[in-house]
């Protein structure tokens, strides 16, 4: 398919040939095409390419481009060349190459698909059956991300309530650049009857921790001391805390954001591994205190800013008066 | 009590490189990022970028990704902020913030005045 | 980018008058991270409130913060003569451009 520029050109080069386009894992869409015929022999050959919206324009010297692309709609790339990586110069006529996603009922898919990535250690997707949809349908997931080697079927789907979904292992690997990829997520049924639904989870996104656990509560003078155990996988400089003191007295819910803090007072159990400790001011020991904590995700680790854990379970201590 | 301390004030012509920096103290200098903030003459506060300590990981604005560059000395509890070739857009006052990892800034340096004029 | 607005640009009052300072968020954010300034003129900002709704060390409760979503709120409830400032909402690498508080 040629698509031409309205505005006048000199000197272009010949299009682009054997443009094709194919799939690779389950998101990964690769163009590819060779040299135009007959170009001019001191032509250095640059590629200009650009989606079908216009958007991510490209000049490279290489026959290939690649998205990662959840292919629940049709995507087209344009490719033309040129003698120059000047964005300003008229590429040749531009040909166009578009891919279209699996056949099947668009209100067959099933929508509302999510994935959370729990405690960095297993990911845990969800969604609602389509509207067009058997009650009976038995669903399939399949996830691929950059270490491993094949597309992998996930086996524990589950369903609670109106959901459906499935969860498998996924483990943070010590290599740094782990995180800067996605995982490819595509939701289909056994039988073929249903349109295939993808996603795209980066990495950096939809991370819960699991929540801390208190080991320790303790009073000296005024303050109350608290000690927990933090979630295993993540590094301090990608957590913080939120330490909820309610007082059955005075009825105050106090809440504090606490940074991973070391245990050095005398009053904490030391040189605990992984624990933190956070000192509450002016708590009345002579009543009772009730303590839970939560934790998140920095949002300079992960991009995903709204997913808090689970509050641990509470903790009291000191005594409730009795009420005269 | 927590402290940043920042360098003096400098005057730069274009071209030039220039080093700025921030001694923490008062607090586990390893444990918070610290960041920087730029604030132009009679304009808002502009935020730069931030390091942390602990691991030396660095996140920059994308407007200053490549302008600038932020370090640190765990050792002796200092933060860094360089430029190699100084503009005379680069005139501005420059502060150094501490950052617990929920993203406000609790304390802040006195400020360094960087002026670029030929 | 999340850009952040503030309203208004300059607020005009009385000691002892109520201010109220809004900073919108182009998307929805975690109040989590949102942050207010207080910045006198030839003076480092200081931190006001952090995670939309709690009081820094040392601030005085005559400042309260509010908000959720993409819409925010600091309040001062009587101002006082030192309270006449630039005040900033910040959420990690976005500041709003400020909100002169002056003496009418």
């Known amino acids: 398919d040629y698509k031409d520029d309205d505005e006048s050109r000199t000197e272009t080069q010949p299009p682009v040939t054997n443009l094709s386009v194919s799939v690779e894992n389950l998101c990964t869409v690769i163009w590819t095409w060779n040299p135009p015929e007959g170009a001019s022999s001191n032509c250095s050959l640059w590629y200009f390419s650009h989606f079908g919206d216009k958007q991510d324009k490209k000049i490279a010297p290489e026959t290939r481009r690649s998205i990662e692309v959840p292919l629940n709609e049709r995507i087209c790339l344009q490719v033309g060349s040129q003698c120059s990586t000047n964005e300003s110069e008229k590429p040749s006529i531009l040909v166009e190459k578009c891919i279209s996603p699996p056949e099947g009922d668009p209100e067959s898919a099933v929508t509302e698909l999510q994935c959370i990535w729990h405690n960095l250690s297993y990911m845990k997707c969800s969604w609602l059956p389509g509207r067009n949809t058997s009650p009976d349908t038995n669903y399939t997931l399949y996830y691929w991300h950059r270490s491993l080697e094949k597309i992998h079927q996930c086996e524990n789907i589950f369903r609670e309530g109106q959901y459906f979904g499935c969860s498998f292992d996924l483990t943070k690997v010590k290599d740094s650049s782990f995180e800067q990829h996605s995982v490819q997520i595509m939701v289909k049924d056994n039988a073929g009857k249903i349109k295939p639904s993808f996603n795209i989870v980066p990495l950096t996104s939809r991370v819960k921790p699991d929540p801390p656990h208190i080991k320790n509560l303790s009073f000296h003078n005024d303050d109350l001391y608290v000690q927990w155990e933090n979630p295993q996988n993540f590094i301090s400089r990608c957590l913080f805390y939120e330490v909820e003191v309610n007082n059955s007295q005075t009825e105050t819910h106090n809440v504090f954001y606490v940074q991973e803090a070391k245990c050095e007072n005398p009053e904490f159990e030391r040189n605990v591994e992984n624990t933190s400790c956070f000192m509450v001011p002016g708590v009345l020991p002579d009543t009772l205190n009730t303590v839970r904590i939560r934790v998140k995700t920095n949002k300079l680790c992960y991009e995903d800013d709204k997913l808090w854990s689970n509050w641990s379970q509470e903790m009291s201590i000191g005594k409730k008066r009795n009420s005269t | 009590e927590v402290q940043l301390v920042q360098s003096g004030a400098e005057v730069k012509k274009p071209g030039e490189s220039l080093k700025i920096s921030c001694k923490g103290s008062g607090y586990s200098f390893t444990s918070y990022w610290i960041g920087w903030v730029r604030q132009m003459p009679g304009k808002g506060l502009e935020w730069m970028g931030v390091?942390?300590?602990?691991?030396?990981?660095?996140r920059y604005s994308p407007s200053f990704q490549g302008q600038v560059t932020i370090s640190a000395d765990k050792s002796i509890s200092t933060a860094y902020l360089q430029w190699s070739s100084l503009k005379a857009s680069d005139t501005a006052m420059y502060y150094c913030?501490?950052?617990?990892?929920?993203?406000?800034?609790?304390?802040w340096g006195q400020g360094t005045l960087v002026t670029v004029s030929s | 980018e999340i850009v952040l607005t503030q309203s208004p640009g300059t607020l005009s009052l009385s000691p002892g008058e109520r201010a109220t300072l809004s900073c919108r968020a182009s998307q929805s954010i975690s109040s989590s991270y949102l942050a207010w300034y207080q910045q006198k003129p030839g003076q480092a900002p200081r931190l006001l409130i952090y995670?939309?709704?709690s009081r820094a060390t040392g601030i005085p409760d005559r400042f309260s913060g509010s908000g959720s979503g993409t819409d925010f709120t600091l309040t001062i409830s009587r101002l006082e003569p030192e309270d006449f400032a630039v005040y900033y909402c910040q959420q990690y690498a976005s500041f709003g451009q400020g909100t002169k508080v002056e003496i009418k």
């Open positions: 913030v501490r950052m617990p990892n929920w993203g406000s800034l609790d304390h």
């Open positions: 995670g939309a709704s």
């Open positions: 390091i942390y300590p602990g691991d030396s990981y660095t």
